[in-house]
């Protein structure tokens, strides 16, 4: 019996036309939603004038349906048993699952001012930027609609820059009508224990963002893992959102719609400083902001974002060092709400439920030559928003899964 089941599973999780896995892999049968909470700054003037703590108030959720588009350019390579594809991006606003509309206004850090002052550290250039910031009536903070903040707006300051720069700014710009990849993953035909594991991303086995092992593209994309998952395993996966590979460890057994699943979570150790977790030394890319690599819980992904000072963390700086959150008032981290987990059906390796949570922050530093940043006395890693991307297997699919997979085993 068990061998027969194993044989069936091995056959059905291969990523090729005709298998259960392939059908769900090309276009996810699960509805995936991305909820955003925006950090609305309550005291912009006090921060700019007196370098006060930034008081934030989260507003949300604002919900979008995502990952509803089928993978594109799906190409099998029989020679090396891989399948390559593009994952198209799309987001549809869901008013009924949101607290407001895409036209809601927020006071947030001026993304262009913060980024430009960081990218152009030459003081003469900063003086040029200062005159353009003043001319465009820009400031350290700005009021933007949700739609602008997420998907892009024409920045008045950047529009005055006399040399070629992208004048459209947005945290996820460009998004709609773009695609992530090309991914090339093992299809499992020759070796089922490699199924869905990424061979190359954008044609490379490395990212070129980090030093040493930190730069490796490890594991799958977290949508599925090779079958017969053990609780003792450390599940590696790559997330293009955070420009790195990361891992999850077993936390507990969960019953999901009658299906026994393993809950794997991202441990705090994954976000620790090299002092605590020496493996993380290569994620520390500079010495000043990281306080000689002793700070933890924030990841500088500027190299992956054309030099823009983007820092990724968990929501509300969960698992981050006190010095990171100290200049920000209004944060309340808690594991239940703010950690990332994957609920994996161990026999197939399919992720049947997940909650991917992350926070997007931007570094802003004092600048002697930029008037609106001149009074700052310290660096701030400013939270802009946090997101919760979730997906749960539908009832119909769960019934099918129970009858065809877990039911047969029990």
């Amino acid at each position: 019996g068990d061998l027969l089941i194993q044989k069936t599973i091995k056959k059905q999780v291969v990523l090729e036309e005709g298998t259960i896995a392939f059908k769900n892999w090309v276009k996810t049968g699960t509805e995936v939603y991305r909820q955003f909470w925006i950090f609305d700054v309550q005291n912009p003037q006090e921060v700019m004038m007196n370098s006060s703590n930034i008081q934030v108030k989260q507003r949300g959720p604002y919900t979008y349906r995502v990952r509803f588009l089928a993978k594109e350019n799906v190409t099998q390579d029989a020679e090396d048993n891989t399948v390559s594809f593009l994952q198209p991006n799309g987001a549809i606003f869901e008013p009924s699952l949101s607290v407001g509309t895409e036209a809601d206004n927020f006071t947030v850090l001026n993304l262009a001012v913060a980024a430009a002052s960081h990218i152009y550290q030459n003081q003469f250039v900063q003086m040029i930027l200062n005159s353009l910031i003043n001319k465009s009536k820009s400031s350290m903070f700005q009021v933007r609609t949700l739609r602008e903040l997420l998907w892009g707006y024409r920045d008045p300051f950047l529009s005055l820059v006399p040399y070629p720069v992208t004048t459209t700014v947005g945290l996820f710009y460009p998004y709609n009508n773009t695609a992530d990849g090309v991914y090339k993953v093992f299809n499992g035909k020759d070796n089922i224990s490699k199924v869905a594991i990424i061979d190359t991303y954008k044609g490379k086995r490395n990212l070129s963002y980090w030093e040493s092992h930190c730069d490796m593209i490890n594991g799958t994309d977290a949508a599925s893992f090779p079958p017969f998952v053990e609780k003792s395993q450390v599940l590696q996966f790559f997330s293009s959102d955070i420009c790195r590979s990361i891992y999850a460890v077993f936390e507990s057994d969960v019953n999901l719609k009658g299906i026994p699943v393993y809950r794997f979570v991202l441990p705090s150790k994954a976000f620790a400083s090299p002092v605590e977790n020496p493996d993380n030394y290569c994620f520390c890319t500079e010495k000043i902001i990281s306080k000689n690599c002793t700070s933890y819980g924030v990841l500088d992904i500027s190299k992956c974002k054309e030099g823009r000072p983007v820092y990724i963390s968990l929501p509300h700086f969960l698992y981050a060092s006190p010095d990171v959150s100290e200049p920000i008032d209004g944060l309340n981290p808690n594991e239940e709400e703010h950690r990332t987990y994957l609920d994996i059906e161990p026999i197939t390796g399919f992720t049947l439920q997940f909650a991917k949570r992350l926070q997007v922050n931007l570094l802003v530093k004092p600048s002697e030559k930029i008037q609106v940043l001149k009074n700052l006395k310290r660096n701030y890693i400013v939270p802009i928003l946090w997101l919760n991307e979730t997906g749960t297997i539908g009832d119909e699919k769960a019934n099918m899964f129970r009858s065809q997979v877990t039911g047969k085993i029990n």
């Epitope: 030459n122 003081q123 003469f124 250039v125 003086m127 040029i128 030559k369």
Partner: antibody, heavy 122, light 107 residues
Framework: EVQLQQSGPELVKPGASVKISCKTS????????MHWVKQSHGKSLEWIGG????????AYNQKFKNKATLTVDISSNTAFMEFRSLTSEDSAVYYC???????????????WGQGTLVTVSA | ETTVTQSPASLSMAIGEKVTIRCITS??????MNWYQQKPGEPPKLLIS???TLRPGVPSRFSSSGYGTDFVFTIENMLSEDVADYYC?????????FGAGTKLELK
Amino acid sequence: EVQLQQSGPELVKPGASVKISCKTSGYTFTEYTMHWVKQSHGKSLEWIGGINPYNGGTAYNQKFKNKATLTVDISSNTAFMEFRSLTSEDSAVYYCASDYFYGDANPWFAYWGQGTLVTVSA
Amino acid sequence: ETTVTQSPASLSMAIGEKVTIRCITSTDIDDDMNWYQQKPGEPPKLLISEGNTLRPGVPSRFSSSGYGTDFVFTIENMLSEDVADYYCLQSDNLPLTFGAGTKLELK
């Protein structure tokens, strides 16, 4: 050793244009800002403008906005200043001066060319 | 535009004397003042940069102080080689502006 070598003296007629060059060596050209400074005979110094060779970003003293054009040629590590519609008021020594801005100390005009004398005369 | 008023226009001092030159700016420029020395037939030379920072290789008899709008440049014990023109430059905002200069001569 950082060196800025300017082109030789120029005698030009009123209404004409002149293009002065400043060839650099001893450093990474794109990492330093290049400025141009005017010094009329027996007078003080006037900042004309500056250019960031890395991206071509320029800033001019409004007084010279319609008079001077600053450019660079990265392949030859050379900065240029073109001065147009010359009058006797433009007779002066013109200096190129560069500075390096990374780190805490900000040395404006740390390195200078030897100067180019421009004489405007009919 | 920040105007820089430099005084005195000329100064005649004996060797060993203390030399003081002053620059006043029309706007608050923090400590973004620089000082240059120019000898005849030569380009100016940077002595002191922003934040009253003495440049490497410049003798310690040269110093400066000041913040906001009032700045002072000092030569503690004048030597004959210090005969030159001296200029201040504000680098807080564009356009960068120089003082009119001080001609330092030997008494």
